[in-house]
């Protein structure tokens, strides 16, 4: 996959808190997988965080602490991509229903989903509270955040020889040293303001010439719509 | 293929440490989750942990406060401690490795385990 | 903690006989449900996971179904090597094995 003060979601830093407002944990408990929310009552996550039971938590910064702005929902629908595959990771995407509808505000909104598909070197925000050491175990209690680049499809291959289909792409940077890692899946990538990744695989963490591996969202567009529109 | 070899003392006096380390060999140790699970004579199997080669590490939680779990990639190796050991712990203690395709999915979740080493025998007396 | 019943705890079979053993979790936990087979004196082997999915190498005679909280495996024609103790496995959350049901000839 499924990791120093310096090093965070590896390589990244600290998000200004309530930031990254349409960010959401998942916990089963404890946080497992990270999530976007789409609209008022679904988040969008990887098919392989997929459990029988989700609470999804907002408004989320340091998730080992009621800071006064979460709000905590349990999943009514949990719907995996039909064509997921654990094996390959492909397809790897994943809608859950809140019990409820989330209560929009300043700190908890929602994400656009994708108009076109994610254009190499467009600069992109990952974020989650997955491991912030590339060797070794740091879990941090507050959100990471990290800024990083779309590589070509070609440079994503030669990365990843017969592993990268067409709905997965690659963010980050060759040389190593800043990545998402375990803890993160699920979670966004967002550029320009919309949401084109979600946090699905990648060899270790910030090795050099294994980038991170995310699902190309674009592709599922109308999947998200059609999945939403029958189960609402 | 891969094969998983378990090592350490067979006898452990009672409130000292067990250390165990398992030797991977056929493969690499790298980018995969790797598990120790115990079984005590003619009883059932109870799962004790799980460390990834990053180093992240998941316990039982029943055992959580007396198991550490570590990983030397350069050996090829992961270990086992538990510390305040007593009888109850005497068992053929196995490692394994996990059942996901690459270990290379970014969730903290679990699988299984596809690939077992053969056990070793650790008895907790005075 | 996700507990598994597992039944029976043992049973007696004849050679070519179909055998069937059932798991039961506590709580939902989806599909993420694995089988093993434990010979005397060895390590488990898995032989589905997933609750359906078949490991490479494992004989076809192997089966198992079910999701949620109830699960079957079933051997369709049971072999003399297939004698051994058989564990079920949840992976929902954590890990936890059911009791074993251990497998006999007739």
């Known amino acids: 996959a499924p990791f120093d003060d310096d090093d965070k979601i590896v390589g990244g830093y600290n998000c200004e808190e309530n930031s990254v407002p349409y960010q959401v944990s998942l916990n089963s408990g404890y946080h497992f997988c990270g999530g976007s929310l789409i609209n008022e009552q679904w988040v969008v996550s990887a098919g392989h965080c997929y459990k029988s039971r989700i609470q999804v938590r907002l408004g989320e910064h340091n998730i080992e602490v009621l800071e006064g702005n979460e709000q905590f929902i349990n999943a009514a629908k949990i719907i995996r991509h039909p064509q997921y595959d654990r094996k390959t990771l492909n397809n790897d995407i994943m809608l859950i229903k809140l019990s409820s509808r989330a209560v929009i505000n300043a700190r908890v909104s929602t994400i656009s989903l994708p108009t076109a598909p994610p254009a190499t070197g467009t600069k992109c925000l990952i974020s989650g509270w997955g491991n912030t050491a590339s060797s070794g175990a740091d879990y941090p209690d507050e959100l990471q955040c990290l800024d990083a680049p779309v590589l070509s499809q070609a440079k994503c291959e030669a990365s990843y020889p017969g592993k990268i289909t067409s709905n997965m792409f690659c963010v980050g940077f060759l040389e190593g040293g800043k990545d998402s890692c375990q803890g993160d899946s699920g979670g966004p990538v967002v550029c320009n303001g919309q949401l084109q990744g979600v946090v699905s695989w990648g060899d270790g963490c910030a090795q050099k010439n294994k980038p991170g591996v995310y699902t190309k969202v674009y592709n599922y567009v109308k999947w998200i719509k059609n999945t939403i529109a029958a189960n609402s | 293929q891969v094969q998983l070899q378990e090592s350490g003392p067979g006898l452990v006096k009672p409130s000292e440490t067990l250390s165990l380390t398992c030797t991977v060999s056929?493969?690499?140790?790298?980018?995969?989750?790797w598990h120790w699970i115990r079984q005590p004579a003619g009883k059932g199997l109870e799962w004790i942990g799980r460390?990834?080669?990053?180093?992240?590490?998941f316990y039982n939680p029943s055992l959580k406060s007396r198991v550490t779990m570590s990983v030397d990639t350069s050996k090829n190796q992961f270990s086992l401690k538990l510390s305040s050991v007593t009888a109850a712990d005497t068992a053929v203690y196995y490692c394994?490795?996990?059942?996901?395709?690459?270990?290379?999915?970014?969730?903290?979740?679990?699988?299984?385990?596809?690939?077992w080493g053969q056990g070793t025998t650790v008895t907790v007396s005075s | 903690d996700i507990q598994m019943t597992q039944s029976p705890s043992s049973l007696s079979a004849s050679v070519g006989d179909r055998v069937t053993i059932t798991c039961q979790a506590s709580?939902?936990?989806?599909?993420?449900l694995n089988w093993y087979q434990q010979k005397p004196g060895k390590a488990p082997k898995l032989l589905i996971y997933?609750?359906?999915n078949l490991e490479t190498g494992v004989p076809s005679r192997f089966s198992g179904s079910g999701s949620g909280t109830d699960f079957t495996f079933t051997i369709s024609s049971l072999q003399p090597e297939d004698i051994a103790t058989y564990y079920c496995?949840?992976?929902?959350?954590?890990?936890?094995f059911g009791g074993g049901t251990k497998v006999e000839i007739k």
């Open positions: 394994a490795r996990d059942l996901t395709n690459y270990g290379w999915s970014k969730s903290i979740r679990f699988y299984g385990m596809d690939v």
């Open positions: 056929g493969g690499s140790i790298s980018s995969h989750y």
């Open positions: 460390i990834h080669t990053s180093g992240s590490t």
């Open positions: 709580q939902d936990i989806s599909n993420y």
């Open positions: 997933d609750a359906s």
């Open positions: 496995q949840q992976t929902d959350n954590f890990i936890t």
